[in-house]
Interface confidence: low
């Protein structure tokens, strides 16, 4: 029986370890600066790194600019978006800016897109200062189903800070759905 | 066999409980207001509480102003930094401020420091208003190895809000590394 | 013994699954726009949705405008608060605003209220711009005991953005208390 107990414990430990890892998808995606759209309109950001520097992904998929959920669950989602402008880049089209981020969820089964989280600020970036910077952070806890897609929309994409520590978004699974 | 089963369940429950707790280091560190550097330059903040008020730590170490990882894993890191100024404190050196936070990771094995997250804003704190306030929040999911150190750098440290609900940073382990 | 082992594994899986779910309370509450207080003073927000749209709750209770903890543990708490004003809504009482959020914990046993997290900014919302917007995000890791209550206070409640993606707060349990 002792040997059996050891086997029980052993097999369960393996199972627990395996299922625990399988049960915890995550992603941390950082902006791909080589392909940031220009302009000031609201756009969906489609170019993100998933496998270099701080960027990583496990048990989720990154495709066509969207983070795809492979496993039902409750996830904590977050995004950090930095905007910056230096006078050497030339003048801003307008000094009154609306710097915004929208974290959206798209369901393929029911073709629809919904904003889960938004954040940002209107800013007056006057010519008085040679450098301007502003960051937005949002985060929240959401039920996600397999196949649903998370994407990021921003205003004024041409002002995005291209550093991996500045502009990123991510998700990690916290628990199963009952 | 029933007794054996009970023993198996019991021993496993203890083991599961124990390993679960061991697998989940965390820290929430709040600013130590008695030792905030002066000036407006970018500095590393080294004085944090880890055991009073909201501050707490478990299975991580706080030493020399840095939060040290004791256990490999994927962690959610966060920081909330508040800046404030009241006219009764005297005039600001400049009304144009860059209020920033940088969350950095240092590896002792390979002596190098890298910024994981940054946030902040340029601000115009004019003399028109008697009180100014601004908060930054950043958060993200990162792979941390035992021995790596997390630290916080800010600009304009003399403007930091010294309250424990205002200026803090923390981490909690979400999952093991595969 | 094989049958016994299967029974052990089976019962443990059920137990593990059950206890895992029971061990992970969460809530994501979104603003109830039909009942936002007016004015510019600091108020406690008492009207939140817990069961429509993105709002959800499990193993926690929402009552009298407060999120009540039912299970001891360490929780990650977060809040996202958006303020906005359009000139079509009429003039602001003052162009100099203090837009703030306070996440507070109340213990019924010891009737006392403490601020866990705060964030925000002073803003100058001038008549030059027809639209103004600003969002605050805060988050942190806290030990919460059964019966403790989490509530949200804001300044300038009349400026709150009533969208569910804009103004919300939440919590999820990360681990037990040792």
């Amino acid at each position: 029986i002792r040997a059996e107990k050891a086997m029980v414990d052993g097999s369960w430990l393996d199972l627990a370890k395996r299922s625990k890892l399988e049960a915890q998808p995550f992603a941390h995606l950082t902006i791909n600066a080589t392909d940031i759209p220009s302009g000031s309109h609201k756009v969906s950001l489609s170019s993100w790194y998933h496998d270099r520097g701080w960027a990583k992904i496990s048990n989720m998929t990154f495709s066509n600019g969207k983070l795809i959920v492979n496993q039902d669950g409750f996830y904590y989602l977050y995004a950090n978006i930095c905007f910056r402008h230096h006078e050497t880049s030339g003048d801003l089209a307008t000094e009154y800016l609306q710097l915004m981020v929208y974290v959206t969820k798209t369901s393929i089964k029911i073709p629809s897109s919904h904003t889960l989280m938004k954040g940002g600020s209107t800013k007056y970036w006057s010519g008085n200062s040679e450098f301007h910077f502003y960051s937005i952070n949002v985060g929240g806890f959401f039920k996600l189903r397999s196949g649903e897609e998370i994407s990021i929309e921003v205003s004024n994409p041409s002002l995005l800070d291209p550093d991996q520590d500045a502009t990123y978004f991510g998700a990690f699974k916290v628990r199963d759905i009952d | 066999i029933r007794a054996e089963k009970a023993m198996v369940d019991g021993s496993w429950l203890d083991l599961a409980k124990r390993s679960k707790l061991e697998a989940q280091p965390f820290a929430h560190l709040t600013i130590n207001a008695t030792d905030i550097p002066s000036g407006s330059h970018k500095v590393s903040l080294s004085s944090w509480y880890h055991d009073r008020g909201w501050a707490k730590i478990s299975n991580m170490t706080f030493s020399n102003g840095k939060l040290i990882v004791n256990q490999d894993g994927f962690y959610y890191l966060y920081a909330n930094i508040c800046f404030r100024h009241h006219e009764t404190s005297g005039d600001l050196a400049t009304e144009y401020l860059q209020l920033m936070v940088y969350v950095t990771k240092t590896s002792i094995k390979i002596p190098s420091s890298h910024t994981l997250m940054k946030g902040g804003s340029t601000k115009y704190w004019s003399g028109n208003s008697e009180f100014h306030f601004y908060s930054i929040n950043v958060g993200g999911f990162f792979k941390l190895r035992s021995g790596e150190e997390i630290s916080i750098e800010v600009s304009n440290p003399s403007l930091l809000d010294p309250d424990q609900d205002a200026t803090y940073f923390g981490a909690f382990k979400v999952r093991d590394i595969d | 013994i094989r049958a016994e082992k299967a029974m052990v594994d089976g019962s443990w899986l059920d137990l593990a699954k059950r206890s895992k779910l029971e061990a992970q309370p969460f809530a994501h509450l979104t603003i109830n726009a039909t009942d936002i207080p007016s004015g510019s003073h600091k108020v406690s927000l008492s009207s939140w949705y817990h069961d429509r749209g993105w709002a959800k709750i499990s193993n926690m209770t929402f009552s009298n405008g407060k999120l009540i903890v039912n299970q001891d543990g360490f929780y990650y708490l977060y809040a996202n608060i958006c303020f906005r004003h359009h000139e079509t809504s009429g003039d602001l009482a003052t162009e100099y605003l203090q837009l703030m959020v306070y996440v507070t914990k109340t213990s019924i046993k010891i009737p006392s209220s403490h601020t866990l997290m705060k964030g925000g900014s002073t803003k100058y919302w001038s008549g030059n711009s027809e639209f103004h917007f600003y969002s605050i995000n805060v988050g942190g890791f806290f030990k919460l005991r059964s019966g403790e209550e989490i509530s949200i206070e804001v300044s300038n409640p009349s400026l709150l953005d009533p969208d569910q993606d804009a103004t919300y707060f939440g919590a999820f349990k990360v681990r037990d208390i040792d």
Epitope: G39, S40, H41, D91, E95, N128 | - | N128
Partner: antibody, heavy 115, light 107 residues
């Protein structure tokens, strides 16, 4: 009501100088970028200069070094100092407030450059 | 500099007609485009900003659309007071530049 009232247009000889003025009312003058746009007889609109609230000044290539834009917030006034005027500078000159596009315009003032 | 090209240069229409004027930028300007109306001996008047936002006080029969390089101004039902010259203008980068204008005449 937002208003921009212009003055200073005149007949001037080639090589001469002129100063145009534009007085704003009905808005906080110091908070807006302000611009000068001109229109030669029978032609289209041409932006020539702008000043941002921080004092940054901008010019089209054809007037750089000859024209100077300035403002006096205390007087709610915008100015365009035009030196070394040429025949091709003859036009109606408009001042305009710039927020999202040029949302308000002055009534225009005629500058004639002729010998 | 960014070149702005309007078409047509002129057009004739009648009261009640639906009229469309197009404007093309030599490079992408996002939505930083404005439309103005100018009547003889008068200052231009702002109609549309940010490609599609109606300036305060402008009748809703005026609308703008487009993004990037191609833009349109539409007057859904022409009124007698709409006969004028229309200009597009980019303010994506300095120097701001105008189209050559489209003269709208009574048929």
């Amino acid at each position: 009501e937002v208003q921009l009232v212009q003055s200073g247009g005149d007949l001037v000889h080639p090589g001469g100088s002129l100063r145009l003025s534009c007085v704003g009312s009905g808005f906080t003058f110091s908070h807006y970028p302000l611009h000068w746009v001109r229109q030669a007889p029978g032609k289209g609109l041409e932006w020539i200069s702008g000043i941002h609230t921080g004092g940054g000044t901008y010019y089209t290539d054809s007037v750089k070094g000859r024209f100077t834009i300035s403002s006096d917030n205390a007087k709610n006034s915008l100015y365009l100092q035009m030196n070394t005027l040429r025949a091709e500078d003859m036009a109606v000159y408009y001042c305009a407030r710039g927020r999202n596009s040029f949302d308000y315009w002055g009534q225009g003032t005629l500058v004639i450059v002729s010998s | 500099d960014i070149q702005m090209t309007q078409s047509p240069s002129s057009l004739s229409a009648s009261v009640g007609d639906r009229v469309t004027i197009t404007c093309r930028a030599s490079q992408g300007i996002s939505s930083w485009l404005a439309w103005y109306q100018q009547k003889p001996e008068k200052a231009p008047k702002s109609l549309i900003y940010a490609a599609s936002s109606l300036q305060s006080g402008v009748p809703s029969r005026f609308s703008g659309s487009g993004s990037g390089t191609d833009f349109t101004l539409t007057i859904s039902s022409l009124q007698s007071e709409d006969f004028a010259t229309y200009y597009c203008q980019q303010y994506n980068s300095y120097p701001p530049t105008f189209g050559q204008g489209t003269r709208l005449e009574i048929k």
